[in-house]
Interface confidence: low
C-alpha cells in the first residue's frame, strides 16, 4: 500500500503518499478551531507509470495509453485513497464544541 | 456535474471531463480484442481550484491550501468518478468469447 | 537543480558507430521522458526519438534501425547508440526532457524542458 | 509524416517594434494545442518559451505570446529587445504519426 509505512521510509518519484502539516490559521485562515492548531494531512503526488498501484481497469489504460504516447495530455493522477476523521475543539460563544470532521488526513495513495 | 453534458459544451480549463478515443492495437497494443476497434474512454484533466467539484473535505482543505500557498506541490488532482463498463469480443482460438469490462469508460470527473 | 549533460560526441569515421550518454541529474528518469534531438551546422532543429519514463522507446521514421535510445535510471543516463553513421549525421546532438505540467505526466505538448548543452559529433574520414 | 513550415525565413526589426513568426502545420497538431515555441541564441541550446500554443512558460517575458489552434500558430514579441536575438523554432506533437514531433525550420529574429 502507498502509506506512510512504505512511502515515508522510501524515497520514491512514483506516487506515494507526501508528509503534509497544516497550522489552520496561517495555512487555511481559519480561526475558529480551537484545538488542535494543526494536523498532519498528509497528501498525495507523483507520477503514475503503467501499473503502479492503478485504481481502476481505466486507469490501467490510460497509464498504458500514457506510456505509448507520453506527448498526450491523458494519464491517471496520484489521489487519497484511505482517508480518516480529525477531531477538533471549537467554541460557540463560550460553549466548546468537540466535532469529528470527516475525510480530513490521508492515509494512502492510489493512481486514478 | 463534471460529465459530457456539461464539459462537451463548455470551454473549460478546470476539471472536466475530457473526449479521448482509444485505438486498442495503436494506442495500447491490444491485438486480442476483436471488436471494437477502439472505444471512447474519455479522461479527467484541469485545474482543482478551491470548491470545485471537491470530493472530500481533504481536497476542500487541500485546495485552500494551494490558494495560500500556490508554490506548493500539494493540490486536489482532477480524476474520474462515475465509471462505465466496455463489451468487447475476443477469440480463444476459434471460439467468440463476449465479456465485460469493468470501468473502461469515464462518465464524470471530481476533484481529489 | 534539473540537468542534462551529453557527452560521448567526436570525430567519427563514415560507417562506424557511436554511443552518446546524457547524464541527468535533480529529476528520476521513471517519472520523465527524454528526447534526441539533434542539429546539423547552420541548420535546424530535428528530433531523433525518446524514450518514455515507462521505457518505451520511440524514433522518427528516419532514425529507426539506425539510432536506438537506452537508459540505464540507476546510473540516471540515457544513451544514443548510433550505427552506420554518414557525413549527413554530422551535428550538435541534444538531450532534452519532456516538461511535466502540476508535478505530473500530464501532458509534454512537444515541450522540451531542460535541454542539454549538446555534444557535437562529425563524420569525416 | 508532418511538416511545419515558418515564415519568415528571417525577421529584422527594429528595437521596440513588433515582431510575429507564423508556423503552418501539414496536419493537425494532437489535441489542436500541442505546438511549443522555442528560441536559441549562437551556441546555446534551445528555449522553451512557450508549450501548448500559448502557455509561457515559467521565466518567460510577457512580451512574448502564442496563439492559433489546429494547423496554423503564431508567435508574437510586441516589443522587440536586443536579448531577443535568435533563431525561433516551432514545434508540433502528432498523435498516430510515425513521427511522433515535428520542428519547423526556423526564423531568425535580427536588429535592424
Known amino acids: 500500500a502507498l502509506d506512510a509505512a512504505y512511502c515515508f521510509r522510501n524515497v520514491q518519484d512514483n506516487c506515494c503518499l507526501r508528509p503534509l502539516y497544516i497550522d489552520f490559521k496561517r495555512d487555511l485562515g481559519w480561526k475558529w478551531i480551537h484545538e488542535p492548531k494543526g494536523y498532519n494531512a498528509n497528501f498525495c503526488a507523483g507520477a503514475c507509470p503503467y501499473l503502479w498501484s492503478s485504481d481502476t481497469q481505466h486507469s490501467r489504460v490510460l497509464s498504458l495509453y500514457n506510456t505509448i504516447n507520453p506527448e498526450a495530455s491523458a494519464s491517471p493522477c496520484c489521489v487519497s485513497q484511505d482517508l480518516e476523521p480529525l477531531t477538533i475543539l471549537y467554541y460557540i460563544g463560550k460553549t466548546p464544541k468537540i466535532e469529528q470532521l470527516s475525510n480530513m488526513i490521508v492515509k494512502s495513495c492510489k493512481c486514478s | 456535474a463534471l460529465d459530457a453534458a456539461y464539459c462537451f459544451r463548455n470551454v473549460q480549463d478546470n476539471c472536466c471531463l475530457r473526449p479521448l478515443y482509444i485505438d486498442f492495437k495503436r494506442d495500447l497494443g491490444w491485438k486480442w480484442i476483436h471488436e471494437p476497434k477502439g472505444y471512447n474512454a474519455n479522461f479527467c484533466a484541469g485545474a482543482c481550484p478551491y470548491l470545485w467539484s471537491s470530493d472530500t473535505q481533504h481536497s476542500r482543505v487541500l485546495s485552500l491550501y494551494n490558494t495560500i500557498n500556490p508554490e506548493a506541490s500539494a493540490s486536489p488532482c482532477c480524476v474520474s468518478q462515475d465509471l462505465e463498463p466496455l463489451t468487447i469480443l475476443y477469440y480463444i482460438g476459434k471460439t467468440p468469447k463476449i465479456e465485460q469490462l469493468s470501468n473502461m469508460i469515464v462518465k464524470s470527473c471530481k476533484c481529489s | 537543480e534539473q540537468q542534462l549533460v551529453e557527452s560521448g560526441g567526436g570525430l567519427v569515421q563514415p560507417g562506424g558507430s557511436l554511443r552518446l550518454s546524457c547524464a541527468v541529474s535533480?529529476?528520476?528518469?521513471?517519472?520523465?521522458?527524454v528526447n534526441w534531438v539533434r542539429q546539423a551546422p547552420g541548420k535546424g532543429l530535428e528530433w531523433i526519438g525518446y524514450?518514455?519514463?515507462?521505457?518505451?522507446?520511440y524514433y522518427a521514421s528516419w532514425a529507426n534501425g539506425r539510432f536506438t535510445i537506452s537508459k540505464d535510471s540507476a546510473k540516471n543516463s540515457v544513451y544514443l547508440q548510433m550505427n552506420s553513421l554518414r557525413a549527413e549525421d554530422t551535428a550538435v546532438y541534444f538531450c532534452?526532457?519532456?516538461?511535466?505540467?502540476?508535478?505530473?505526466?500530464?501532458?509534454?505538448?512537444?515541450?522540451?524542458?531542460?535541454w542539454g548543452p549538446g555534444t557535437l559529433v562529425t563524420v569525416s574520414s | 509524416d508532418a511538416v511545419l513550415t515558418q515564415t519568415p525565413l528571417s525577421s529584422p526589426v527594429t528595437l521596440g517594434q513588433p515582431a510575429s513568426i507564423s508556423c503552418q502545420s501539414s496536419?493537425?497538431?494532437?489535441?489542436?494545442?500541442?505546438l511549443s515555441w522555442f528560441q536559441q541564441r549562437p551556441g546555446q541550446p534551445p528555449r522553451l518559451l512557450i508549450y501548448?500554443?500559448?502557455t509561457l512558460t515559467s521565466g518567460v517575458p510577457d512580451r512574448f505570446s502564442g496563439s492559433g489552434a489546429g494547423t496554423d500558430f503564431t508567435l508574437k514579441i510586441s516589443r522587440v529587445e536586443a536579448e531577443d536575438v535568435g533563431v525561433y523554432y516551432c514545434?508540433?506533437?502528432?498523435?498516430?504519426?510515425?513521427?511522433?514531433?515535428?520542428f519547423g525550420g526556423g526564423t531568425k529574429v535580427e536588429i535592424k
Open positions: 532534452a526532457r519532456h516538461m511535466q505540467v502540476g508535478g505530473a505526466p500530464t501532458g509534454s505538448m512537444a515541450a522540451f524542458d531542460p
Open positions: 535533480g529529476f528520476s528518469l521513471s517519472s520523465y521522458t
Open positions: 524514450i518514455s519514463y515507462g521505457g518505451s522507446a
Open positions: 496536419q493537425s497538431v494532437y489535441n489542436n494545442n500541442y
Open positions: 501548448g500554443a500559448s
Open positions: 514545434a508540433g506533437g502528432y498523435s498516430g504519426s510515425s513521427d511522433k514531433y515535428a
